[in-house]
């Protein structure tokens, strides 16, 4: 199983059988009357993984997912029949597919489902403390799920619940045509993106939503939505997809005369993830599939990891691109996209930009406007007509950090762990695929920290049958990875150091930041441990320097090093 170290070949390739035999995967193979284990909520404090599925919500123990509680939340027979009469599939559509699962407060979760094409939401009691062992549906309190969950289970939803308000990117109608970014719940009138205007949203597929602070003043907080959508005519010849990042001010309450109960601070920009191609034409990875925000020292400046695939039928490929929030903010402070009419090209807007600059949050920091309802008419008019930025956001180092083009799978999900190793910190990516495998990739800084080399450490099959991975969460506390698909949920440790072999050289050559040779075995590396010198070299994977004892003998000839 141990492969030699070419970038595109995993050092360790483990089949599902091997994962099981080595106790490296625990699988929950689903219930007979459920499926679609797509909606994850990780609660490290309670040591639970909440999972929304078809007609069910689960609470798995993070230590071992075989230990779980479940809530059954189906639709009524009447509702199911109405759905069937509307021409929908009784098994695949006429059920309650859970699409939203968020922490509401200290004692409750908020959950929404498709409700057999009639979205519905409710609260789930989870108690104050883990030992309360409470997990029950609030049967007396159901709410309309419109603008929160889609009607159609096939549609993606991105949501975020903060301060009792739910931000959702979803379809608000039965037909799945009226896509919008909503803010619901709370005490205010719902707010949404402009209706019937393809410049705002053009058949989007929502990926995720995140709150990111702009400054130390909470009035400047913004909610960022990641999505992909059809490129607007004139942006591209032919039908194309663009990956997007959209921003909204948390304290946006809509306009006064125009954009009433609509966002006044919504802006969007294109995310570029491409490689130079032949004839000087870049190959674009435009189909954004997943996003992970790596919050390290500064929560205002997380690193954004995006997983992309190509939309081409001829060329199938996947990539991971990294973005910095400073680059994102720079684009949102740059020129707006403008065109004089449907038959004109998009150009950077050259005219006078009204004050305060559209997209700026009303706060005491900038502009002195207390509310979006106080914004001057020219700001609202401009915002309504110019939701898109002209410049795209380019990835760090202007290229992907991971590319896969010669394989029979595509990337679907990503989570990232920052690991302390002997020679520094490394970001380890766990990338889910559409065939049920997980790739473990480490990005290794070269000359500069953003000039990265990627090393494919492991390729693990985590489900018995090939099935697309649709959800992933990583628990740093448990050092475990949790994976969701249509078929079920899987759990695996972040590291399998013992599998790298019985010698120092093999451990060193693995270049796995989690693992180091401790003198007798390849085991988990803890930077705080006062153990005897650990042999590890992630940057170069050089056993000659680090394995001075007999651990190398007789083994070096088997592992040709290609870096």
């Amino acid at each position: 199983n141990y492969q030699n170290g070419k970038n595109n070949v995993p050092r360790l390739k483990l089949s599902y059988k091997e994962m099981l035999e080595s106790n490296n995967v625990i699988t929950f193979n689903g219930l007979a009357n459920s499926s679609s284990y797509h909606t994850f909520l990780l609660d490290e404090e309670r040591s639970r993984l909440y999972v929304g599925a078809k007609d069910h919500i689960f609470s798995f123990d993070l230590v071992n997912i075989k230990d779980f509680q479940k809530i059954v939340w189906p639709v009524s027979y009447t509702r199911r029949d109405e759905c069937k009469w509307a021409g929908k599939d009784i098994l695949k559509e006429c059920a309650n597919f859970i699409k939203v699962l968020k922490a509401y407060n200290q004692t409750h979760l908020y959950a929404c489902g498709t409700g057999a094409f009639h979205p519905i939401c409710t609260y789930i009691e989870i108690g104050h403390h883990p030992e309360d062992n409470i997990f029950k549906l609030e049967n007396s309190h159901f709410e309309n799920g419109r603008g929160k969950s889609p009607y159609d289970p096939k549609l993606l939803t991105a949501s975020l619940l903060i301060d009792g308000e739910l931000y959702s990117g979803t379809a608000a109608d039965f037909m799945g045509r009226d896509f919008a970014i909503f803010r619901t719940l709370g005490h205010h009138h719902p707010i949404r993106t402009e209706q019937h205007d393809s410049r705002w949203l053009n058949d989007p597929k929502f990926i995720s939503a995140h709150l990111i602070s702009e400054s130390d003043n909470p009035e400047d907080d913004k909610v960022y939505f990641f999505f992909r959508e059809n490129a607007i005519d004139g942006e591209h010849s032919g039908k194309a997809t663009h990956a997007r990042i959209g921003q909204i001010c948390k304290n946006d309450f809509g306009g006064h005369r125009s954009l009433v109960n609509k966002w006044t601070t919504f802006l969007k920009a294109r995310l570029i993830c491409s490689v130079p191609g032949p004839n000087g034409i870049d190959t674009h990875f435009d189909e954004l599939q997943d996003v992970f925000l790596m919050n390290f020292k500064d929560p205002k400046n997380p690193v954004v990891y995006g997983v992309f695939t190509t939309s081409s039928n001829i060329f199938k490929g996947s990539a991971v691109c990294m973005y910095s929030m400073s680059d994102v903010r720079r684009v949102f402070l740059g020129p707006y996209a403008h065109r004089d009419g449907p038959n004109y090209q998009w150009v950077p807007y050259q005219g006078r930009v009204p004050y305060p600059r559209p997209g700026t949050c009303p706060s005491k920091t900038f502009g002195g406007f207390d509310s979006t309802k106080d914004l001057p008419d020219d700001v609202i008019t401009f915002a309504r007509s110019h939701p898109a930025m002209y410049n795209p956001v380019f990835p760090m180092n202007n290229r992907p950090i991971v590319i896969k083009t010669d394989v029979n799978y595509q990337f679907t999900q990503i989570v990232v762990d920052r690991v302390d190793a002997e020679d520094g910190q490394y970001d380890v990516m766990f990338i889910g695929t559409d065939v049920g495998t997980v790739l473990k990739v480490v990005s290794i800084p070269k000359e500069t920290w953003y000039d990265l080399e990627e090393v494919l450490l492991e390729e693990m099959t985590v489900f018995r049958e090939p099935t697309a991975i649709s959800a992933m969460e990583l628990s740093t506390k448990q050092q475990q990875l949790y994976i969701g698909s249509t078929a079920g949920v899987a759990q695996l440790p972040l590291h399998r150091c013992d599998i790298y072999g019985k010698a120092c050289a093999e451990c060193c050559l693995a270049r796995d930041p989690y693992c180091a040779w401790d003198g007798s075995a390849c085991s988990r590396y803890f930077p705080t441990a006062k153990a005897r010198t650990r042999a590890q070299d992630i940057r170069n994977g050089d056993p000659l320097t680090h394995c001075s004892d007999g651990g190398i003998e007789g083994r070096m000839d088997h592992h040709h090093h290609h870096h």
Partner: antibody
Framework: EVQLLESGGGLVQPGGSLRLSCAAS????????MNWVRQAPGKGLEWVSG????????DYADSVKGRFTISRDNSKNTLYLQMNSLRAEDTAVYYC????????????????WGQGTLVTVSS | QSVLTQPPSVSGAPGQRVTISCTGS?????????VHWYQQLPGTAPKLLIY???NRPSGVPDRFSGSKSGTSASLAITGLQAEDEADYYC???????????FGGGTKLTVLG
């Protein structure tokens, strides 16, 4: 005070054309979606067509699709309905109506209506 | 044939309470879309009476109230007055063509 004033109705032969206008005042016209709704003599209301504030979205009832064209001129605060290939069943009072979107879920309501203009299609 | 079904007529004596029903399907009212009600006095244009199932625009007396449940909605008028004699229409969103759907209308007659 919000006012909508339709004009352009009249008697026309089957296959003929008419252009209806609706002059709006008392509100920011270019902030609202506008619609045409008709009512055949002694019958109920039927939505005919709708247009978004910037004409980016336009929709028609199947019964008029391909024959009627809705448009607006925000600089003149005016909504139009060009009706071609008129049929006897198009005989109705045509109302211009503003979409209010007052409800929580932004489902269109018609918060202001004009007094209507009668279109009679007959030979 | 209207997409939403209303009774053709209802009647009541002054001071009485009457209700007008409006029945749709799973692709309009039953899909969670809001219902709005209009009053059309003889020879005049319709006027918005109730929006968003149960909300009254300013100027509409509180004798008028609306509710919605499942695939149906209803308009209730209490303390019936002679000037309430009119046609009443319910309306909802459909998401499919036609994008807006109306009921066939209900003629309210105030007896006496």
């Amino acid at each position: 005070e919000v006012q909508l004033l339709e004009s352009g109705g009249g008697l026309v032969q089957p296959g003929g054309s008419l252009r209806l206008s609706c002059a709006a005042s008392g509100f920011t016209f270019d902030s609202y979606e506008m619609n045409w709704v008709r009512q055949a003599p002694g019958k109920g209301l039927e939505w005919v067509s709708g247009i978004s504030w910037n004409s980016g979205w336009i929709d028609y009832a199947d019964s008029v699709k391909g024959r009627f064209t809705i448009s607006r001129d925000n600089s003149k605060n005016t909504l139009y309905l060009q009706m071609n290939s008129l049929r006897a069943e198009d005989t109705a009072v045509y109302y211009c109506a503003r979409s209010g979107y007052s409800s929580s879920w932004f489902d269109p309501d018609f918060d202001y209506w004009g007094q209507g203009t009668l279109v009679t299609v007959s030979s | 044939q209207s997409v939403l079904t209303q009774p053709p007529s209802v009647s009541g004596a002054p001071g009485q309470r009457v209700t007008i029903s409006c029945t749709g399907s799973s692709s309009n009212i039953g899909a969670g879309y809001d219902v709005h009600w209009y009053q059309q006095l003889p020879g005049t244009a319709p006027k918005l009476l109730i929006y968003g199932n149960s909300n009254r625009p300013s100027g509409v007396p509180d004798r008028f109230s609306g509710s919605k449940s499942g695939t149906s909605a209803s308009l209730a008028i209490t303390g019936l007055q002679a000037e309430d004699e009119a046609d009443y229409y319910c309306q909802s969103y459909a998401g499919i063509n036609p994008y807006v759907v109306f009921g066939g209308g209900t003629k309210l007659t105030v007896l006496g």
